[in-house]
C-alpha cells in the first residue's frame, strides 16, 4: 500500500543509521519528475536542512544544506543509476564523516556532514514519487 | 474532495476554451514546491507540448513547448501572483494569438501560440500541489 | 609533501592595498576548499575568507567585507587576497590554510605572511 | 566577543590529565575542531570532527562534544604540550569561526 505523499517522519539519526527508501517515478523521463529527500532540524518544514537530496530523474542529483534558512554550496552529480519507470530502493547511510547514498544496492553519491546529524529530528520525501516504503534503522548500542 | 496528482484529462482547445484549475501548494514557498500544466498533443504523457506551465513556487514561472521531443526556447517571468499556503485558481484562456493566464482573477502571463491550440488532446496538471478543481469550458458556437 | 606558501605581505600606509598569495603543492589544489585567517600580534586566530573549488562561492568575515576579495587560480595551484582601503586594525601575520570537509576542518596551514598597516 | 568561548589559561601537573573546554551554541550543531600553537609556529589540528585524531598527533590528546560545549582531553601530559590551544567551528558551513584560544601551561 502506499504512504502519502509529502511523507514526514520524526528522526534521530546517528553514525551507523540508515534510512531506507521505496517507490517509483509518477511520470517518465522525459518529463523530468523529481524525488526529494530533506533532512531537517525541526518538525517544522521550514526548519534547516541538514541534508538535502533532490533527482531530477533522468537528468541529475543535486546535494546540499539549508543553514539559517539560507541554501549553501551545491553539490551535483550526473551519476543516473534509476531507471525510467522501474521502483528504486535508496538508502541514506550515516557513515562518520559523510552520508553514503545507495541506489538499488549500488553507491551512487556521498555528501561530506556540513551539519552534525545528530541535529536531524524530522526526515520528509516529496516530490513526483509513489512511496511503498519508508524506514530508519538504528545502530544496536 | 481532492482529485487525484497528477490529473490527467482529454481535452479539445480552440479559441475561445479555458481551463480551470483550482488547488494548492503541498509546501511552504522556501521548499520550492512546483505546480505545472502541460498541454498534450497526444493522450500519452511522453508526447509533445503545446503549452508547458511551470510554476516554482515563490520564485519564478516558465513556459515552454516541447515540438518532436524537444524543448524550445524558454519563456521566464518572475512576476509570483501565487500566495504562500494560500489556495490559488488558475485559469488558462485560449486567445486567438496566445495563452492568456489568470490567477486568482488576475492576467498574470501569456504565451504566444507556437502550435496551433486544436492540436491539444490531453492536459496533464502535477508535480506539488493538491487539486480541487479541474474544468475545461468550451466557447458555445 | 604538501606546502602552502604565502607571500605578498609588507608595510603599508592606512588606505593602501597589497595583494597575498599562496602558492599551493603536493595535492590536487582544485580539489578544495581554501581560507585566509589571521592572528594579529600576540592575539588569537581570526577567520578572513573563504572560497570554494571554482571560486564561484566566496565569503568573508564583517570586519573585512567589501575590502577584501579572494580568488585562486586552479591552473597554478593559487589563491589570493586583495586587501584593500587597509587599516591599522589589519596589521597581522595571514595564513593560508588547505579547508578539508566541515568534518574535517582546516587540515593544513601555511607559514604565513605579515602585513603591517602604519602610518 | 568570540562566538566560541575558552578559559584564557589551563594548568596541569605533569603527567596528569589537562581538559580545555569550549563553548558555544553553534557546537550543538556544527563540529568542533582543534588546533595547537607553539610560539613562533603555525597552528597545527589535533582533533577534528569533535574526537578524532589526525595521523601523526599522539594518542593523548582526545575530544568529545556534548551539546554546546567541545572539550580537548590531553591524558598525561607532557611538557611539550605547552602550547596555546584553539577550538574551532562554524558559523554556518562557510563561515569558520574561532574560540579565544587557552594557554596551556605544563608544571
Known amino acids: 500500500s502506499l504512504l502519502p505523499v509529502p511523507y514526514t517522519e520524526a528522526a534521530s539519526l546517528s553514525t551507523g543509521s540508515t534510512v531506507t527508501i521505496k517507490g517509483r517515478p509518477l511520470a517518465c523521463f522525459l518529463n523530468e519528475p523529481y524525488l526529494q529527500v530533506d533532512f531537517h532540524t525541526e518538525m517544522k518544514e521550514e526548519s534547516d536542512i541538514v541534508f538535502h537530496f533532490q533527482v531530477c530523474f533522468g537528468r541529475r542529483v543535486v546535494m546540499n544544506s539549508r543553514e539559517y534558512g539560507a541554501w549553501k554550496q551545491q553539490v551535483e552529480s550526473k551519476n543516473m543509476p534509476f531507471q525510467d519507470g522501474q521502483e528504486f530502493e535508496l538508502s541514506i547511510s550515516v557513515l562518520p564523516d559523510k552520508y553514503q547514498v545507495m541506489v538499488n544496492g549500488q553507491s551512487s553519491y556521498t555528501f561530506d556532514h556540513r551539519i552534525k546529524p545528530e541535529a536531524v529530528k524530522m526526515v520528509q520525501v516529496w516530490r513526483d514519487i509513489s512511496l511503498t516504503k519508508f524506514n530508519v534503522s538504528y545502530l544496536k548500542r | 474532495s481532492l482529485l487525484p496528482v497528477p490529473y490527467t484529462e482529454a481535452a479539445s482547445l480552440s479559441t475561445g476554451s479555458t481551463v480551470t484549475i483550482k488547488g494548492r501548494p503541498l509546501a511552504c514557498f522556501l521548499n520550492e514546491p512546483y505546480l505545472q500544466v502541460d498541454f498534450h498533443t497526444e493522450m500519452k504523457e511522453e508526447s509533445d507540448i503545446v503549452f508547458h506551465f511551470q510554476v516554482c513556487f515563490g520564485r519564478r514561472v516558465v513556459m515552454n513547448s516541447r515540438e518532436y521531443g524537444a524543448w524550445k526556447q524558454q519563456v521566464e517571468s518572475k512576476n509570483m501572483p501565487f500566495q504562500d499556503g494560500q489556495e490559488f485558481e488558475l485559469s488558462i484562456s485560449v486567445l486567438p494569438d496566445k495563452y492568456q493566464v489568470m490567477v486568482n482573477g488576475q492576467s498574470s502571463y501569456t504565451f504566444d501560440h507556437r502550435i496551433k491550440p486544436e492540436a491539444v488532446k490531453m492536459v496533464q496538471v502535477w508535480r506539488d500541489i493538491s487539486l480541487t478543481k479541474f474544468n475545461v469550458s468550451y466557447l458555445k458556437r | 609533501q604538501l606546502q602552502l606558501v604565502e607571500s605578498g605581505g609588507g608595510l603599508v600606509q592606512p588606505g593602501g592595498s597589497l595583494r597575498l598569495s599562496c602558492a599551493a603543492s603536493g595535492f590536487t589544489f582544485s580539489n578544495y576548499w581554501m581560507y585566509w585567517v589571521r592572528q594579529a600580534p600576540g592575539k588569537g586566530l581570526e577567520w578572513v575568507s573563504a572560497?570554494?573549488?571554482?571560486?564561484?562561492?566566496?565569503d568573508y568575515a564583517g570586519s573585512v567585507k567589501g575590502r577584501f576579495t579572494i580568488s585562486r587560480d586552479n591552473t597554478k595551484s593559487t589563491v589570493y587576497l586583495q586587501m584593500n582601503t587597509l587599516k591599522p586594525e589589519d596589521t597581522a601575520l595571514y595564513y593560508c590554510l588547505r579547508g578539508g570537509s566541515y568534518y574535517g576542518g582546516m587540515d593544513y596551514w601555511g607559514k604565513g605572511t605579515l602585513v603591517t598597516v602604519s602610518s | 566577543q568570540s562566538a566560541l568561548t575558552q578559559p584564557s589559561a589551563v594548568s596541569v601537573s605533569l603527567g596528569q590529565t589537562a581538559r580545555i573546554t569550549c563553548q558555544g551554541a553553534?557546537?550543538?550543531?556544527?563540529?568542533g575542531i582543534w588546533y595547537q600553537q607553539k610560539p613562533g609556529q603555525a597552528p597545527v589540528q589535533v582533533i577534528y570532527g569533535d574526537s578524532n585524531r589526525p595521523s601523526g598527533i599522539p594518542e593523548r590528546f582526545s575530544g568529545s562534544s556534548s551539546g554546546g560545549t567541545a572539550t580537548l582531553t590531553i591524558s598525561g601530559a607532557q611538557a611539550e604540550d605547552e602550547a596555546d590551544y584553539y577550538c574551532q567551528s562554524y558559523e554556518s558551513s562557510t563561515s569558520p569561526v574561532f574560540g579565544g584560544g587557552t594557554h596551556l601551561t605544563v608544571l
Open positions: 553553534k557546537l550543538g550543531r556544527y563540529y
Open positions: 572560497i570554494d573549488v571554482g571560486g564561484g562561492t566566496t
